[in-house]
Every structure is written in structure tokens, then in C-alpha cells.
Amino acid sequence: EMGTADLGPSSVPTPTNVTIESYNMNPIVYWEYQIMPQVPVFTVEVKNYGVKNSEWIDACINISHHYCNISDHVGDPSNSLWVRVKARVGQKESAYAKSEEFAVCRDGKIGPPKLDIRKEEKQIMIDIFHPSVFVNGDEQEVDYDPETTCYIRVYNVYVRMNGSEIQYKILTQKEDDCDEIQCQLAIPVSSLNSQYCVSAEGVLHVWGVTTEKSKEVCITIFNSSIKG
């Protein structure tokens, strides 16, 4: 059996299948590695596009698991980044394995907006709450922000009334309809006994990526009384 000290320069295998997944702007790098007689450790480095004198920054150093959260090392979520991973076994290191280009805003997933529905006088009020995401470790909403290109530009709101569906588009930049917490849609209540079911999804600026669609929430109006 070969000892680690005897391994040749290229005998530490390179990690494989370096991929990045992001949910709610929280990107995590994953990779695969073959089983070794000695436990390997990994170093993960990130390079952001569009940063002056962009260089590889350490994100995780000498870790034994096969994933690394790089959310603290992402600049503008609209910009591209690359990741590379190397393995170390004893005193020897592998070559780097590099990821594909990844932009958190373009390639990641964002969860659905939350919905609230209620009756106010002669109308149904629908509140669409912006999804919460994590940017540089801080929780914030993906509402309109002129300082970044990664924000929800429009909500598609789907309203089913007694079987027929109507789609509304809400532009988030319009302050009368939206603020930094939510957007609001008002629909007249018909005089008939009616059920209103609502779901919504956001559309991100620039790439037109859609968030996950919310679960449908419903309200039934019985002669001016409400059943949620």
C-alpha cells in the first residue's frame, strides 16, 4: 500500500463536478471526490467579475466536507463569478477544478412571494410580500432597488374567480402600488357568491428569471360574509 509521502506530483486527484446552487441568493458550491485512504481536505476560492484587480479569494480553507457556502464572497449578484476547488492529501495538493461561470441573479432560484388575501368593504385586497433573500449575510427583500440590477421588476398575479383566470401585472417601481415590503392589488367583489383564488410569481430585471410561484390562497365570499 502506497503511503501519502510517496505520492507523485499528479497523484492527488482533482475534485470533479464543481457546481454552484443558489436559493434566495445564498450560493453554495458542491463537488465530488473519490474515496481516498487518507481524508482529503479542500480549499475553495472565488473570483468575482467586475471587481477591480479581481483575484481569487479564499472562501473555505482546509475543509473536509464537499460543500462551501460562498454567500459572504459574492459582490453584485448580477455579476458573474467563478469558483475553483483543490484537494490536499497530507502535504500534496491537486490541481484546481473550476466551475462554470455563475451569476446568482441569473442562475440561482428565488422562493415565492408570500400572499395575503382579505375583504375590505366592496373589494378584495391582495398583499404580495417580496421574497426575503440573503445578500452578504443580511436579510433583505428583492424589491426595486436602483443601485442593483437584481430585483423583482414585475409580479404576475393570477386570480381565479369562479373558474375563469385573470392575470395582473404589477410593476414594482410604481410607489402607489408597491413599497419596499409588498405590492398590493385590489379587485372588486362581485355581488354573486364567489371564490377568489390567487397565486403570484416575480420576474427579475434583466434576465427575466421568474421566482417560484406561490401556493394559491383562496377566499370565499358568501353574501358579504367571508370564509378564508
Epitope: K122, Q123, I166, K169, L171, D176, D177, A186, I187, P188
Partner: nanobody
């Protein structure tokens, strides 16, 4: 109380474009959600599009989605309907309607005030 006057209708060939305008009297135009409806000869009145008070929220009938665009200019007390790629089945009298408050209706009964209408004829 608000009075609505439509204009911009006429005869156009299939595939052509028209822009309808609806001007409201009074100084409280921004209080009203606005809608466009149409009625073809011998048919029921049909919802076309609606727009919120600020202009930030819109909705369209499936039959016109991607071809028609509703917009408004609150400074001019006017709501517009830009109609592109017109089809013969778009031939109808087009009415604009106003509803006091934020609620955006898709039924005629949702609206409080109506214009007299403008005729759009699309020929083949």
C-alpha cells in the same frame, strides 16, 4: 362625477395599428381605475384591459394579450389603448370606463362611469 370621451377609432386593415384615447373631465382622474371594453355587433360586451390608478398594474383579456397595451397619463387625464396586429375579430365599439378607487375590475358591472364609445373596423 367624471365624463369620458373616447377618440381614435376608424377603419384599418388587418395587421394594422390604432391608438385609442379616452379623456376624462375633472381634476380627480388619478382617483380612478380605468378599463377598456368592447362590444361587437350582436355580441355581449367584452373586457379588453384595465389599468390601476398609478398605471403600474395592468390586466388584459387573453384575446388581446401581447397585441394591445393599456397606459395612462394622469397629467393629461387620459387613458390609451395601443392596438397592434389588428384582426377582423377586433371589430367592435370600444368603450372606456372608470371606477372610483383602487380596485381593478374585469366585469362591466365593476365600473361606475362610461364613455359613449368609438368604432373600430378592421377589414381584411
Amino acid at each position: 362625477q367624471v365624463q369620458l370621451v373616447e377618440s381614435g377609432g376608424g377603419l384599418v386593415q388587418a395587421g394594422g395599428s390604432l391608438r385609442l384615447s379616452c379623456t376624462a373631465s375633472g381634476r380627480t382622474f388619478s382617483r380612478y381605475a380605468m378599463g377598456w371594453f368592447r362590444q361587437a355587433p350582436g355580441k355581449e360586451r367584452e373586457f379588453v384591459a384595465t389599468i390601476s390608478r398609478s398605471g403600474g398594474t395592468t390586466s388584459y383579456a387573453n384575446s388581446v394579450k401581447g397585441r394591445f397595451t393599456i397606459s395612462r397619463d394622469n397629467a393629461k387625464n387620459t387613458v390609451y389603448l395601443q392596438m397592434n396586429s389588428l384582426k377582423t375579430e377586433d371589430t367592435a365599439v370600444y368603450n372606456c370606463a372608470a371606477r372610483d378607487g383602487p380596485a381593478m375590475g374585469v366585469f362591466g358591472s365593476d365600473y361606475d362611469y362610461w364613455g359613449q364609445g368609438t368604432l373600430v373596423t378592421v377589414s381584411s
